[in-house]
Amino acid sequence: ESGYAQNGDLEDAELDDYSFSCYSQLEVNGSQHSLTCAFEDPDVNITNLEFEICGALVEVKCLNFRKLQEIYFIETKKFLLIGKSNICVKVGEKSLTCKKIDLTTIVKPEAPFDLSVVYREGANDFVVTFNTSHLQKKYVKVLMHDVAYRQEKDENKWTHVNLSSTKLTLLQRKLQPAAMYEIKVRSIPDHYFKGFWSEWSPSYYFRTPEINNSSGEMDPI
């Protein structure tokens, strides 16, 4: 019922590896959901290739993805979010590869934001707080967060703390005195919905106080 590709195009196409991965973001723009897919091989020739999703849609049988440079995406309210959809890479009407995917199992939350660290002198600790847009959402409300921090000079020596709230207390005695720290946070679905880690929030930088020689305690900044 649809267009076609030249035979040569199809023969060339069959030589390539068209494996791809996708993630969904629910209520990412008001009530709109998004679905983003990309080829795993960055060198695949994407000329004349399209992505299509069929099934588990509210209003149409199939939808075509929009291509934006190397990624393909759909932004719509029309995902049923019940059952599996069939996502295919197509040349004209020929499907090169397909995957059956439940969009609720490939959810990538939005990155947390407004990360900040406040030092409490009396308690000798640091209160880490951040925000997430998911607190206001209807679907993906419950998240697990991964807070990662490191001393700035330690390139790859991150300490990770998992938590379900948006507040974390770091004890001063667990940190090096008079040191600059970098901290960041990301989120993953943690109830009914499954999927992937969000992007990291922008990093926040803070300095620990020096040790007060007489008391052995750190000075506030």
Partner: antibody, heavy 122, light 107 residues
Amino acid sequence: QVQLVESGGGLVKPGGSLRLSCAVSGFTLSDYYMAWIRQAPGKGLEWVSTISASGLRTYYPDSVKGRFTISRDNAKNSLYLQMNSLRAEDTAVYYCARPLSAHYGFNYFDYWGQGTLVTVSS
Amino acid sequence: EIVMTQSPATLSVSPGERATLSCRTSEDIYQGLAWYQQKPGQAPRLLIYSANTLHIGIPARFSGSGSGTEFTLTISSLQSEDFAVYYCQQYYDYPLAFGGGTKVEIK
């Protein structure tokens, strides 16, 4: 503002050919699926063809499949319908139509041209 | 292929009265239905999409309902400019299809 202007209609003998054009303005053609819809005199609406935003995919009902070809030239802001092996029952006003929603393939139409009349008669 | 059936073919209504138009589909199309109004010598005009979403600029006296295979267009209080032919259209799947139309005429 959005405008769609069809041209190329006229009188043609059965078995003949005709090429309809639709010149569009006021929106980015490459963002939209586009369609041709026809209406025989005194009759209802009949969908004729749809082309995807990229132009890579085309769709037809059985009544015109193999005889009609839809195409587009986004650079020229134009949509086309090549009609071959025309029959008396193809006589109709042919409308070019744009969906309300860009990109994905929701085919309900908020902008229509004024139509161009195709008459197939010997 | 999805077959569209509109009823009645003609509806005679007095101005100010309510008009109810029906559209049935041969298969489940969920909410993939649109309604159009057409006046003589003019192109169709989109009224409703997604079965019940009023298109921008369309008066609130028009409303759509239904899902699956049974759909209704209601005009709550007919105005003189509403006398026209109304078509439903399914866009759930190809081939796209229109109903045969309902002519709303002055009683």
